[in-house]
């Protein structure tokens, strides 16, 4: 019903149309130049479409556009409209960026979609020769132009091209940069075997640099090093010490070689070590000092060998900054050879050497053990005068069951009395001396403490009413004295203590109570110490009856009386026998009686009468007397 053309561009159109909402199957659109020069374009589009873009038309050209719809086999009337495409848009501006010595970048502005492509022409200004012609797609706004000459003036023209139209050209004039070249060649950090080469360049992307190193006298072939184009410095190792060199460099960039730069340089002298000296010698150590080229060595190696090759070789690695070393842990009185070499990244110096002899240790000898007793012994030794600061005496039991005992003594002492040890076991004694912080090799001795002295076999004999005899055995020559302690077992009296001189082995004890049980304890004393005691139980004998008397003597009878002993007895037994011989007669009376009548005697006969006290199986000594019977009448 209505056909309109909106947005007529310079190479295309936008169509819009309206139609009632009949179910159109499709629309047919025809686009033709108004002068009918070209064949018409016929398009079929779906019946639901109401707008279409038609690109690809000619610039500044009049067109007739027609449209009809088809619905259920019926064609609507044709709608038509006339329109013209616009004129070709102009190019904007042309600029040059990133001008190098052999290339540049050309940039330009232009309306989007305006041009099919662009035509670029490059002329050398001085010769007006065309050096490049190129066509690029219309979508581009920038292009790189390589392959130019350095320090050369160029005219560059740009045209926009549509299907059938070219714009007026835009031009720009440009001068390419000078050829790249290196500058500022310098040598830093010259060492004895290498150097560092530095250079400067313009800010270009060099492919690589070629560095050439040659001895100034041309004796050796030149070394060529290729290094990446990003570097501006390089280390050159592996050179000869103290040698003049010529170092050259050139850069390579896009096949172009820059002019060569050169410089002359001499390497430093080879690092050296020397003046190896020994000082501060002691029995176990010494100090070393040496000289060396500064700032070169990573490490020094010191090798120490005893002249007799008896000890394992010792090797020490120390920092290259050191010029001294303290060597310790050596044996005394030993000759050593000391070798020193320096180590740098690519060198080990010649080895230098010197000799050293450790001092002799002061003498410590003659370890002697004496005065051995059950509880200790005396340790003595000899040593050089004023040589030792102190001595260490270590005492340990041979079985190593106990903690060692250590005694530190002044350097003037030569003897140690040991007390308080265990009797009858083995001991090991170690004595070492200290001098200037060094400890001598210890002297060693062994001994066994004597067994504990014993008293034994305490015997009781010859019991009497007021005492008894004690006898015992004991080790000879050990005890200074013996002590006897006696106390009645019922603790009714104070204990007695008797001290006896050493040689005695018996003692009569008197002054005790009769028929009393006593505890006896005996021990020996040796150097103020008591031995283990021995014990016994003893009982004093019963007291005997006393003061026997006769009365009422007739020809065939007599009364005998006595005084009873102090202690209670069970009975008295009276024995009487004629002095001239004959069978004895006996009579037993109660222990409480102190007299009895003897009968059936023979007249005129002398009788011996004895009275004994009895208790259990024990009998007292007798008390005796004589009587004579009267004669017959």
């Amino acid at each position: 019903e209505n056909l309109t053309v909106t947005e007529a561009g310079w190479d295309g159109l936008r169509l819009n149309w309206t139609a009632d909402d009949l179910a159109y199957e499709y629309f047919v659109i025809q686009v033709q130049e108004a002068n009918n020069v070209e064949t018409a374009h016929n398009f079929t589009v779906p019946g639901n479409l109401r707008a279409a873009d038609i690109p690809g038309l000619k610039v500044a050209t009049s067109y007739r556009v027609s449209i009809y719809g088809v619905a259920r086999g019926y064609r609507t009337p044709v709608l038509s409209a006339e329109t013209s495409t616009g004129t070709t848009p102009n190019l904007g501006e042309v600029t040059v960026a990133e001008v190098g010595w052999d290339a540049l970048t050309l940039n330009w502005t232009a309306p989007e979609g305006a041009y099919k492509n662009f035509f670029i022409q490059v002329l050398e200004a001085d010769t007006t020769q065309t050096v490049q012609n190129l066509t690029v797609p219309g979508g581009l706004r920038s292009v790189d132009l390589p392959g130019l000459k350095a320090a050369t003036r160029y005219y560059i023209t740009l045209r926009g091209v549509t299907q059938d139209f070219g714009t007026a050209p835009l031009s720009v004039e440009v001068l390419t940069e000078d050829l790249p070249q290196l500058g500022g060649l310098s040598v830093t950090e010259v060492s004895w075997d290498g150097l560092t080469l530095n250079w400067t360049t313009d800010d270009l992307a060099y492919k690589h640099f070629v560095v050439q190193v040659q001895e100034a006298n041309n004796v050796e072939a030149a070394q060529n090093l290729t290094v990446p184009g990003s570097l501006r410095a390089v280390d050159i190792p592996g050179l000869k010490a103290d040698t003049p060199y010529r170092v050259s460099i050139y850069g390579v960039i896009q096949g172009y070689r820059t002019p060569m730069l050169s410089t002359d340089v001499s390497t430093a002298r080879e690092p050296e070590i020397g003046n190896l000296n020994v000082s501060d010698v002691t029995p176990k150590s010494f100090n070393l000092s040496w000289t060396a080229t500064d700032g070169i060595f990573d490490m020094f190696t010191i090798e120490i060998i005893d002249s007799n090759r008896l000890l394992q070789t010792a090797e020490h690695n120390i920092s290259g900054a050191e010029r001294t070393a303290h060597i310790s842990g050596l044996p005394p009185s030993t000759d050593f050879i000391v070798y020193l070499s320096g180590i740098a990244p690519s060198i080990r110096t010649k080895t230098i050497s010197t000799t050293a002899t450790t001092e002799a240790l002061p003498l410590l000898e003659n370890l002697t053990i004496s005065d051995t007793n059950p509880y200790g012994f005396t340790v003595s030794w000899t040593a050089s005068e004023n040589a030792f600061d102190s001595f260490l005496v270590t005492v340990v039991d041979s079985g190593k069951l106990l903690d060692p005992q250590e005694f530190t003594l002044s350097g003037t002492q030569r003897k140690l009395e040991l007390r308080g040890l265990i009797t009858g076991i083995g001991y090991e004694v170690l004595v070492s001396g200290f001098t200037q912080g060094h400890q001598t090799k210890p002297l060693r001795a062994e001994t066994i403490t004597e067994a504990e002295p014993e008293v034994d076999n305490l015997l009781v004999s010859d019991a009497t009413p007021d005492g008894f005899r004690l006898s015992w055995t004991a080790d000879e020559g050990i005890f200074d004295s013996f002590v006897i302690r006696i106390r009645d077992t019922k603790k009714q009296s104070e204990p007695q203590e008797i001290s006896l001189p050493s040689p005695e082995r018996t003692r009569d004890i008197t002054g005790l109570r009769e028929a009393t049980e006593y505890e006896i304890e005996l021990y020996g004393i040796s150097r103020g110490r008591r031995s283990q005691p021995v014990s016994a139980i003893a009982t004093t004998a019963m007291g005997s009856p006393k003061e026997i008397m006769f009365s009422d003597i007739t020809e065939n009878a007599a009364t005998v009386s006595w005084r009873a002993p102090t202690a209670q007895v069970e009975s008295f037994r009276i024995t009487y026998v004629p002095m001239t011989g004959g069978a004895p007669s006996m009579v037993t009376v109660d222990g409480t009686d102190t007299e009895t009548r003897l009968v059936k005697l023979t007249p005129g006969v002398e009788y011996r009468v004895s009275v004994i006290a009895m208790k259990g199986f024990e009998e007292s000594d007798p008390v005796s007397g004589t009587l004579i019977t009267a004669l017959d009448g």
Epitope: Y26, T39, H41, N42, F43, T44, P46, I54, V70
Partner: nanobody, 121 residues
Framework: DVQLQESGGGLVQAGGSLRLSCVAS???????????LGWFRQAPGKEREFVGA????????YNPDSSKGRFTISRDNAKNTVYLQMNMLKAEDTAVYYC???????????WGQGTQVTVSS
């Protein structure tokens, strides 16, 4: 009968490009240049949508809503092939793309099987 075979679809990242091809065969004695060809697409759950067409004389027409200046249709008569160049693809361009011929009648009589285009964002 005319047979059409599309190709060139596939999975592409948003912002990428694809070029679809459609080869015509069995044109019953008529030359390929005698046909106008169109491209259509159908997204899941939506109606088939016109993308654009090329006339026998090589002129092109586009649906502004779908092409938005990103699509270009061209033809190579020597190869019996029509092309759809799609640039700056978006997730909403995901669809099955069909080519169709409008032959002796003016409507689109013959259709290809379609080629799947998936644009991941």
């Amino acid at each position: 009968d005319v047979q059409l075979q599309e190709s060139g679809g596939g999975l592409v990242q948003a912002g990428g490009s694809l070029r679809l091809s459609c080869v015509a065969s069995g044109t019953s004695g008529l030359t390929f240049r005698s046909f106008g060809l169109g491209w259509f697409r159908q997204a899941p759950g939506k109606e088939r949508e016109f993308v654009g067409a090329i006339s026998m004389t090589g002129g092109t027409i586009y649906n502004p809503d779908s092409s938005k200046g990103r699509f270009t249709i061209s033809r190579d008569n020597a190869k019996n092939t029509v092309y759809l160049q799609m640039n700056m693809l978006k997730a909403e361009d995901t669809a099955v793309y069909y080519c169709a011929v409008n032959g002796l009648g003016l409507n689109y009589d013959y259709w290809g099987q379609g080629t799947q285009v998936t644009v991941s964002s």
